[in-house]
């Protein structure tokens, strides 16, 4: 039995930040779980982890180079990514594992979310500014 995961197909990070919501076909309330976010088509790079259990505060881990926070819903984990760089544009996959209570469960691979990080464009100063007011 596998947990199903739904993600937005694409998100655009205009201000170098984005909220990626991972929605599960499973209620995480009072469960021990590990939710993670993986970068790349082969999911090779794990960039954020949220660990939760029934007795402790949510714990969030960010890989060096990523600034991550996490928020828990009954059937979702939202990863808040900040300070993203243009070269971090990629496809990101949500993964979930539930360890307790038994049985151990994990998810079917999701379709992923393309996060497109838009560079910050500062408005250039005009070459020929208008006449200054007295």
């Amino acid at each position: 039995n596998k947990i199903l995961v739904k993600q937005s197909p694409m998100l655009v990070a205009y201000d170098n930040a984005v909220n990626l919501s991972c929605k599960y076909s499973y209620n995480l309330f009072s469960r021990e779980f590990r939710a993670s976010l993986h970068k790349g088509l082969d999911s090779a790079v794990e960039v954020c982890v949220v660990y939760g259990n029934y007795s402790q505060q949510l714990q969030v881990y960010s890989k060096t180079g990523f600034n991550c926070d996490g928020k828990l819903g009954n059937e979702s984990v939202t990863f808040y990514l900040q300070n993203l760089y243009v070269n971090q544009t990629d496809i990101y996959f949500c993964k979930i594992e539930v360890m307790y209570p038994p049985p151990y469960l994990d998810n079917e691979k999701s379709n992923g979310t393309i996060i497109h990080v838009k560079g910050k464009h500062l408005c250039p100063s005009p070459l020929f500014p208008g006449p200054s007011k007295p």
Epitope: E46, V49, D106
Partner: nanobody, 124 residues
Framework: EVQLVESGGGEVQTGGSLRLSCAAS????????MGWFRQAPGKEREFVAA????????DYAESVKGRFTISRDNAKNTVYLQMNSLRAEDTAVYYC?????????????????WGQGTLVTVKP
Amino acid sequence: EVQLVESGGGEVQTGGSLRLSCAASGRMFSNYAMGWFRQAPGKEREFVAAINYRRDDADYAESVKGRFTISRDNAKNTVYLQMNSLRAEDTAVYYCGFTYAGWASSRRDDYNYWGQGTLVTVKP
């Protein structure tokens, strides 16, 4: 809950070798990392080396690179630290740590569980 038990510490001459082991038990996920930190008397606990479950990510403190090697046996849930060319400044209590992060984290705050520590003494 994760339990960690270290072994392998002891006294050795400068230039000698030791191998530390750390066995983890409890509920494990498909990826996590374990690391070694050390604490000399009167000093902060500092990062030594770490490795993740998939064994595709390892990291070392600059001071031990080329001398220490971290490895793990996933079947035994055990991580090892092979320490060669030991120096007097390597004398410390070595602690094994466990983190739910899936990479070889050097950040002490990322580690959720710690072993009791094993003393390594390097004699001149």
